[in-house]
Interface confidence: low
């Protein structure tokens, strides 16, 4: 039975040209995290594997940095970065937990962070 909960940074916004940290946290489970995938819609951005460490998609390696922790830092943001991002936790023995973050990249200098929310 999957008892865990993923907390994410929720709906967030940032300025064009700036940086943003995508964060997820898995709680309420003793399951072992074997791998975390970060995906943007249908694209795999990065993998953090418990054995092998981080691997950033070479298509994004100039703009994506691993961390902090199991999070992901997006740099040099463009309006094309607006959209859904998913953290996918592969765990044993629970299985897969998925968290969703929506990022809006704004042209203006007004970029406010949304509230945190939980996905059971």
């Amino acid at each position: 039975m999957m008892t865990g909960t993923i907390e994410t940074t929720g709906n967030i916004s940032a300025e064009k040209g700036g940086s943003i940290i995508l964060q997820c946290h898995l709680s309420s489970t003793t399951a072992q995290v074997t791998q975390v995938n970060w995906e943007q819609q249908d694209q795999l951005l990065a993998i953090c594997n418990a054995d092998l460490g981080w691997h950033i998609s070479p298509s994004f390696k100039d703009r994506v940095a691993p961390g902090p922790g199991l999070g992901l830092t997006l740099q040099s943001l463009t309006v094309n970065d607006t959209g859904e991002y998913f953290c996918i936790y592969h765990t044993y023995p629970d299985g897969t937990y998925t968290g969703r973050i929506f990022l809006e990249v704004l042209e203006s200098s007004v970029a406010e962070h949304g509230a945190r929310f939980q996905i059971p």
Epitope: Q35, I47, D51, L52, G53, W54, H55, I56, P58, P66
Partner: nanobody, 117 residues
């Protein structure tokens, strides 16, 4: 001793297909990223594709939809299936073991792929 040996290159007509193989030894294959790179005459070596156990694969935009990378852990072999080949795919193709963070630490000797009519 780590060894990577590529094979499968050759001359192929535009629109044709080839499958490259990379036989690996001397390290734990199923706990490693494997990548394919290529170097065209007079150009720098460029990344083509990477694969991790479990089938996670990434591709350069120039080959997406035409090339497929895979790995057979039981044979310690990585493959690059190339289809709809174009003259600009002509290059020496190398396989490499990639460490964490996309740094390739071991390379094969390369296999030449020539796409020409």
């Amino acid at each position: 001793e780590v060894q990577l040996v590529e094979s499968g290159g050759g001359l192929v007509q535009p629109g044709g297909s080839l499958r490259l193989s990379c036989a690996a030894s001397g390290f734990t294959f199923d706990r490693s990223w494997m990548g394919w790179f290529r170097q065209a005459p007079g150009k720098e070596r460029e990344w083509v594709a990477s694969v991790l156990r479990g089938g996670y694969a990434w591709y350069a935009d120039s080959v997406k939809g035409r090339f497929t990378i895979s790995a057979d852990n039981s044979k310690n072999t990585a493959y690059l299936q190339m289809s709809s080949l174009k003259p600009e795919d002509t290059a020496v193709y190398y396989c490499a073991r990639e460490g964490s963070g996309y740094a390739s630490d071991y390379w094969g000797q390369g296999t030449l792929v020539t796409v020409s009519s």
